[in-house]
């Protein structure tokens, strides 16, 4: 009982003077308040509290369940308690069976006694099993039992205050232990998609995941550069006893080109935080972005192959794509494919294999391209070169001589005189007249050069060598000179 | 002692709304999850909405997402439900009811407001 | 979403029977689930958490169990009070559903 000190308020007095005091049960129980400031009686047991403003407690037949502590406060405040037992031998433990414990922190397993004077108050696991080994407890008779520093492995414990009542082992009703998981990780995060591309006044969708032990992990949406609350809808789950997942989606009903930028999804607990973003491209309309892999001027030599190769970005997805050559459409030697499988691919291939090409077969290539938005080309511009040929040679009436070639590039025509019957001709003569005849033509395709020499110069047998040659080889033509008298009996051109 | 009213229920036609409105009393509604529950005339209970103890996380049954939302004002301990675009099918008896914590379930409910959609 | 299947929708027992309602989860909601008694007029009143823990006040002739998919309300000697109809509904994910119901009437 409190001592008093005159000339400062002091706590109320009780009747019966004790801390503690044990009735049998159907008994009375009888407190006295003596405060002349008195203003009334608490009652507490578990989660139960009753008031009383008399300042005599009667219970006339006490129950197991009158077991608790009585306090007496008066006007200034202060307070005097009294803990009663209420004996029952059918009612050994009074129990609230909800058992959480949080992970790594004591916890309750509230069973007080209703008699005091029991031995070996403890903890007992459920069936007879054993508890785990390194499971601590502290017994209190008038709150209960502590078990301390909760584990996870604890989780779904079963297990019952126990107590030797006259020698017999009794137990309370059964508790199942909640753990409640530490946090002792950041929380996992991931993002359905890490970029979007959409153009004005789609929809704008993105869902973030997040995982953790419990759900008292925090999540949120943030722009970057911006404090907006962004509007979000939730999902959640629960696999198990420590994995939950949360979906938090993120809708833009309606984006607009100012919507572009990135967004992160940020999730903490009290471990620390984690976070991952997406990023969102909004475009006013769609494109096509065409890249020649190879140049756009071609030179292939004769009877090779070629493939015409272009990357290019189309969004929304492209939804024709041909290749053009002389206003015809190829329909097969062509494939066009994603550069990726991911699903955010904007960027495509496509490739126009030419085979064994002919000279004939030189040109402008088209590819074109389109998607609901907009068209989009490039031209390739293919040369193919081919080893001069020797179109015609000839003596003309007024006595020059003539050699027409056909090459590309533009074939060079060279002329030599070999004296006799000589094979290898190296004295040069120089042409009188040269020509390109096909200048202003087709841009593609072999180029015609014509020479002419004057074959009045020549005063002895022998033979004229025209040679016609240019980066792919050479022809050469020849024409046998024969004199009888002072004539040239025969000219006989061959090659 | 915990104590739940509802309020806010009413006739309305279809298309129209309505906000119920759930006056919390003996705990502090930022410490518990709070639910909205219904129950059509003779049928069977029906999840509607959840709202986090942080009032962070909303969650919505398919019936009625886009249409309703339920909020909090921590200061005047209410819990609401803003219903939009009613439906004939929405008439029902409106429960709110808080979420023990840990998933434990729905340990205190409203009496209910009923609400009837109809022209 | 998780569909609740609880049978029987209806039943018929007398004072002091032992009664067994049982609920299907459609997919593992591990020990998620909420046990509810509605009577007529009346809000529903939390019986059982998490599959099989007691709520707060609620006499000990009721029990639950189970794990995963399957679980079970059992009322060991049913009493006059005990006349209503009992719903299960899961909280393991969003959105949380309840089972048909169950209604409990006097034989």
């Known amino acids: 009982q409190p001592s008093v000190s005159p000339g400062e308020p002091s706590p109320p007095s009780i009747h019966p003077a004790k801390s503690e005091l044990i009735v049998r049960v159907g008994n009375e129980i009888r407190l006295l308040c003596i405060d002349p400031g008195f203003v009334k009686w608490t009652f507490e047991i578990l989660d139960e509290t009753n008031e009383n403003k008399q300042n005599e407690w009667i219970t006339e037949k006490a129950e197991a369940t009158n077991t608790g502590k009585y306090t007496c406060t008066n006007k200034h405040g202060l307070s005097s308690s009294i803990y009663v037992f209420v004996r029952d031998p059918a009612k050994l433990f009074l129990v609230d069976r909800s058992l959480y414990g949080k992970e790594d922190n004591d916890t309750l397993v509230r069973c007080p006694l209703t008699d005091p004077e029991v031995t070996s108050y403890s903890l007992k696991g459920c069936q007879g099993k054993p508890l785990p080994k390194d499971l601590r407890f502290v017994p209190d008779p008038k709150a209960g039992i502590t078990i301390k520093s909760v584990k996870r492995a604890y989780h779904r414990l079963c297990l019952h205050c126990s107590a030797d009542q006259e020698g017999k082992s009794v137990l309370s009703d059964k508790f199942i232990l909640k753990v409640r998981p530490a946090f002792k990780a950041v929380p996992v995060v991931s993002v359905s998609k890490a970029s979007y591309l959409l153009r004005e006044g789609e929809e704008f969708t993105v869902t973030c995941t997040i995982k953790d032990v419990s759900s008292s992990v925090y999540s949120t949406w943030k722009r970057e550069n911006s404090q907006t609350k962004l509007q979000e809808k939730y999902n959640s789950w629960h696999h198990g006893d420590f994995n939950y997942e949360r979906q938090a989606t993120l809708t833009i009903s309606s984006a607009r080109v100012n919507d572009s930028g990135v967004f992160m999804c940020y999730a903490n607990n009290t471990f620390g935080s984690a976070n991952v973003t997406t990023t969102l491209e909004v475009v006013d309309k769609g494109f096509i972005n065409i890249f020649p892999m190879i140049n756009t001027t071609v030179f292939v030599n004769d009877g090779e192959n070629v493939d015409l190769i272009v990357e290019y970005e189309a969004f929304p997805k492209p939804e024709h794509q041909q290749w053009i050559y002389m206003n015809r459409t190829f329909t097969d030697k062509w494939e066009d494919y994603p550069k990726s499988e991911n699903e955010s691919n904007i960027r495509y291939v496509s490739e126009l294999h030419l085979t064994r090409l002919k000279g004939t077969e030189g040109g402008t290539y088209t590819f074109l391209v389109s998607n609901s938005d907009v068209n989009a080309s490039i031209a390739f511009n293919v040369y193919v070169n081919t080893k001069p040929e020797i179109l015609t040679y000839d003596r003309l009436v007024n006595g020059m001589l003539q050699c027409v070639a056909a090459g590309f590039p533009e074939p060079t025509i060279d002329w030599y005189f070999c004296p006799g019957t000589e094979q290898r001709c190296s004295a040069s003569v120089l042409p009188v007249d040269v020509q390109t005849l096909n200048a202003s033509g087709p841009p593609f395709g072999k180029l015609v050069v014509q020479s002419s020499i004057d074959s009045s110069a020549f005063k002895h047998n022998g033979t004229v060598e025209c040679k016609a040659y240019n980066d792919v080889g050479k022809t050469s033509a020849y024409f046998n000179f024969a004199f009888k008298g002072n004539n040239k009996e025969q000219i006989h051109p061959h090659t | 002692e915990v104590q739940l009213l509802e309020s806010g229920g009413g006739l309305v036609q279809p298309g129209g709304s309505l906000r119920l409105s759930c006056a919390a009393s003996?705990?502090?509604?930022?410490?518990?999850?709070m639910s909205w529950v219904r129950q059509a005339p003779g049928k069977g209970l029906e999840w509607v909405s959840t709202i986090s103890g942080s009032g962070g996380y909303t969650y919505y049954a398919d019936s009625v997402k886009g249409r309703f939302t339920i909020s909090r004002d921590n200061s005047k301990n209410t819990l609401y439900l803003q219903m939009n675009s009613l439906r004939a099918e929405d008439t029902a008896v409106y429960y709110c009811?808080?979420?023990?914590?840990?998933?434990?379930?729905?340990?205190?409910w409203g009496q209910g407001t009923l609400v009837t959609v109809s022209s | 979403d998780i569909q609740m299947t609880q049978s029987p929708s209806s039943l018929s027992a007398s004072v002091g029977d032992r009664v067994t309602i049982t609920c299907r989860a459609s997919?593992?909601?591990?020990?998620?689930l909420n046990w509810y008694q509605q009577k007529p007029g009346k809000a529903p009143k939390l019986l059982i958490y998490?599959?099989?823990s007691l709520h707060s006040g609620v006499p000990s002739r009721f029990s639950g169990s189970g794990s995963g998919t399957d679980f079970t309300l059992t009322i060991s000697s049913l009493q006059p009070e005990d006349f209503a109809t009992y719903y299960c509904?899961?909280?393991?994910?969003?959105?949380?559903?309840f089972g048909g119901g169950t209604k409990v009437e006097i034989k």
């Open positions: 003996g705990f502090t509604l930022t410490s518990y999850a």
């Open positions: 509904q899961q909280s393991s994910s969003t959105p949380y559903t």
């Open positions: 997919q593992n909601i591990y020990t998620y």
């Open positions: 998490d599959a099989s």
């Open positions: 009811a808080r979420d023990s914590g840990y998933d434990r379930g729905l340990d205190y």
